[in-house]
Amino acid sequence: MAVTACQGLGFVVSLIGIAGIIAATCMDQWSTQDLYNNPVTAVFNYQGLWRSCVRESSGFTECRGYFTLLGLPAMLQAVRALMIVGIVLGAIGLLVSIFALKCIRIGSMEDSAKANMTLTSGIMFIVSGLCAIAGVSVFANMLVTNFWMSTANMYTGMGGMVQTVQTRYTFGAALFVGWVAGGLTLIGGVMMCIACRGLAPEETNYKAVSYHASGHSVAYKPGGFKASTGFGSNTKNKKIYDGGARTEDEVQSYPSKHDYV
């Protein structure tokens, strides 16, 4: 039961995380104008990975896409790439994990196959989460660097008469969404990997010994009630109760008096 819960929770947490990564990638507020000493501004600037926007105090908002590819900073391109890789890996991971879920039966899929798929999706979620965290962190670092550079040049005097105020940018909401989402995806991935351990067939040097008791057909394997995890190929070593196919959790909940040495 714990394995199913861990796997299910890992899937849900990853799903929320990947939805958050997608949302963060699409959001316009990766960087927002710093309102250092002017909390009420008539023109408010904010920027995303794909376009920059200006919101006026009139209520009018204008957004312009970055229609150039070569003219964009390499760091921005790198962040875009990291977020897209994160989304793609996460999406594939979700697809794989759906088929790996214990609560979903697809034909006569083995537990070992489900374990492998769970591990694969878990690793994908971990990498996806790391990509998102890395992307957001690279962007945040870029912002911090630019922030202090623009602070140093805050006022560029022109003949000592006219002042040009440079617009400084600080962390936007998308960064926090990205960090949280990346973290959730990472946690979900770890949970999937933990669940995989509970699903995976255990390697052992012992040979299975069958004990035939009247009215029962029970395959015995050393290792207590984890017997159903089998040896290599899981076909010969499954415990069968009442001739019906049951999940591992169900098998474990009905220990037989014949399971002994």
Epitope: N38, A42, N45, V54, S57, S58, F60, Q166
Partner: antibody, heavy 115, light 113 residues
Framework: EVQLVESGGGLVQPGGSLRLSCAVS?????MNWVRQAPGKGLEWVAW????????TYADDFKGRFTISRDDSKNTLYLQMNSLRAEDTAVYYC???????????WGQGTLVTVSS | DIQMTQSPSSLSASVGDRVTITCKSS????????????LTWYQQKPGKAPKLLIY???TLESGVPSRFSGSGSGTDYTLTISSLQPEDFATYYC?????????FGQGTKVEIK
């Protein structure tokens, strides 16, 4: 078509109070009050945020003037307290349109502060 | 606060003349986010409310004759009337639309010579 009609102006003694109203019809963005003293230039008084209803004032009017709105009546208000002789002016309500411009103006209402 | 300085404060011109009014701001009105200069020009006739002419330094408001044009960036801006018409005799104001408090120039009165 946007229409703005001010009312409430008149003669008031120094230290007195007055409330100006601006009836608004048509689609409005954020709203402002702008004034013009006789023979002088234009002076922005206050702005009210269309989303939050939060006001912003020019320094000279903070604490004395209050801009507010009543969405149910489609009316903008300017409550003026502690009036001085130098507050004598024509007060206009104006819509703030794209570009942060005053694209629609009322006809103005004259406020005279005199003893 | 951003100070707006207009020049000249008044000028006399004849119908058909080319008229230029300048406006200087104490800080740049150019917004880096959209590369637009938040400077606006208004025309006001005696006893009337001001009328919007030009916004974003050079964008003509709809219904305004094409003889009016605006230019400039940063801190220096110009309003040009290519061929003055009788109805153009009025007072012209520039306005900072970039930051609060919104500030106006002192005005330029265009009179008949």
């Amino acid at each position: 078509e946007v229409q703005l009609v001010e009312s409430g102006g008149g003669l008031v003694q120094p230290g007195g109070s007055l409330r100006l109203s601006c009836a608004v019809s048509g689609y409005t963005f954020s709203m402002n009050w702008v004034r013009q003293a006789p023979g002088k230039g234009l002076e922005w008084v206050a702005w009210i945020n269309m989303y939050t209803g939060e006001p912003t004032y020019a320094d000279d009017f903070k604490g004395r003037f209050t801009i507010s709105r009543d969405d149910s009546k489609n009316t903008l208000y300017l409550q003026m307290n502690s009036l001085r002789a130098e507050d004598t002016a024509v007060y206009y309500c104006a819509r703030l349109g794209p570009g942060n411009v005053f694209d629609y103006w009322g006809q103005g209402t004259l406020v005279t502060v005199s003893s | 606060d951003i100070q707006m300085t207009q020049s000249p404060s008044s000028l006399s011109a004849s119908v058909g003349d080319r008229v230029t009014i300048t406006c200087k701001s104490s800080q740049s009105l150019l917004n880096s986010g959209n590369q637009k200069s938040y400077l606006t020009w208004y025309q006001q006739k005696p006893g009337k409310a001001p009328k919007l002419l030009i916004y974003w330094a050079s964008t003509l408001e709809s219904g305004v004759p094409s003889r009016f044009s605006g230019s400039g960036s940063g801190t220096d801006y110009t309003l040009t009337i290519s061929s003055l018409q009788p109805e153009d005799f009025a007072t012209y104001y520039c306005q900072n639309a970039y930051s609060f408090p919104f500030t106006f120039g002192q005005g330029t009165k265009v009179e008949i010579k």
